[in-house]
Amino acid sequence: FKVATPYSLYVCPEGQNVTLTCRLLGPVDKGHDVTFYKTWYRSSRGEVQTCSERRPIRNLTFQDLHLHHGGHQAANTSHDLAQRHGLESASDHHGNFSITMRNLTLLDSGLYCCLVVEIRHHHSEHRVHGAMELQVQTGKDAPSNCVVYPSSSQDSENITAA
């Protein structure tokens, strides 16, 4: 399987909410011996590999925000901790995987990564990730609502197994 990022750039005004999205592409094993681990974190555009570094999102680590379930099951993050920080990650039956950030501030601007790991009994992990940029703007140049910019088809196809 691969991960696609429908949008590579989100430009939002301060105070707005935004939902960043990744999508699982390709066949997903639903067997009893496979588990999917999905999470979000902030990162930096490395010279060699984007999404290598795992920084917290609003002080929550990738482990705080992870989802853990069988293939194409729906899941949500544990509500208490994440919601206290205005965050919620979710996954639906169709391979969509998102994080919602409420009441954006300028400090939320940066590179965000989704990570999906297929964990299978006796096998090495299959890891894939996607990256997108969030720009939070203030002042007269800020949009009134979030504006999203689609990834080029090449970009979304090029997110490979890490």
């Epitope: 011996d33 588990t35 681990y37 999470t39 490395g46 060699v48 590999q49 290598s52 570094e53 795992r54 990738f62 482990q63 992870h66 853990h68 990570l115 790991v117 964990i119 299978r120 009994h121 006796h122 096998h123 090495s124 992990e125 890891r127 890490a162």
Partner: antibody, heavy 119, light 107 residues
Framework: QLQLQESGPGLVKPSETLSLTCTVS??????????WGWIRQPPGKGLEWIGS???????YYNPSLKSRVTISVDTSKNQFSLKLNSVTTADTAVYYC???????????WGQGTLVTVSS | DIQMTQSPSSLSASVGDRVTITCRAS??????LAWYQQKPEKAPKSLIY???SLQSGVPSRFSGSGSGTDFTLTISSLQPEDFATYYC?????????FGQGTKLEIK
């Protein structure tokens, strides 16, 4: 603060079974998204990964030891264990238990326990 | 199995020196490489993950680079507490494997 503590006999006879337990405190061993592993280090030598256990019960073993190794978990005691059977003197080493998150390296280690195989 | 080869196996240096240790994987491991520091009678301590990302709490004089098969750990200005043995480890695929270690000694 997560802490891991190895325990078990420091001396095992050749051909017998080495049994070690790692007790985890400051965190739940059943938390999803973590592996619990064993690594060993013979005196004066380098590190060797023995195997890991995922939070959902999946196991992963080093092929060089697979026929002799079992890693298991006791969630009620917040412990996981290593059994290595048919030991020889080559199995003399410091044995470490450690934790690693999904798609990450070993970030928390026990202090290690020396196991000597000798008659 | 993926073999990890470190060089040098030992080196002598002085406080304030810049030191580089290299690690080569027998096949590509992307950026799934970690570096550890181990002092006598102690457990290894994680310094670097994902080839170049600093583990929380590790001084910024430590840095890592590389991708694929060739990696380096650099200590920009050696401090007395840095004299130890350093190991690389690949976590690209099972079985996880370590380099043989580089012992860093005081000149």
């Amino acid at each position: 603060q997560l802490q891991l503590q190895e325990s078990g006999p420091g001396l095992v006879k050749p051909s017998e079974t080495l049994s070690l337990t790692c007790t985890v405190s400051g965190g739940s061993i059943s938390s999803s998204g973590y592996y619990w592993g064993w690594i060993r280090q013979p005196p004066g030598k380098g590190l060797e990964w023995i195997g890991s256990l995922y939070s959902s019960g999946y196991t992963y073993y080093n092929p060089s030891l697979k026929s002799r190794v079992t890693i298991s978990v006791d969630t009620s005691k917040n412990q996981f264990s290593l059994k290595l059977n048919s030991v020889t003197t080559a199995d003399t080493a410091v044995y470490y238990c450690a934790r690693h998150p999904v798609a990450m390296n070993f970030d928390d280690w026990g202090q290690g326990t020396l196991v000597t195989v000798s008659s | 199995d993926i073999q990890m080869t470190q060089s040098p196996s030992s080196l002598s240096a002085s406080v304030g020196d810049r030191v580089t240790i290299t690690c080569r994987a027998s096949q590509g491991i992307s950026s799934w490489l970690a570096w550890y520091q181990q002092k006598p009678e102690k457990a290894p301590k994680s310094l670097i993950y994902a080839a170049s990302s600093l583990q929380s709490g590790v001084p910024s004089r430590f840095s890592g680079s590389g991708s694929g098969t060739d990696f380096t750990l650099t200590i920009s200005s050696l401090q007395p507490e840095d004299f130890a043995t350093y190991y690389c480890q690949q976590y690209n695929s099972y079985p996880y494997t370590f380099g043989q270690g580089t012992k860093l000694e005081i000149k």
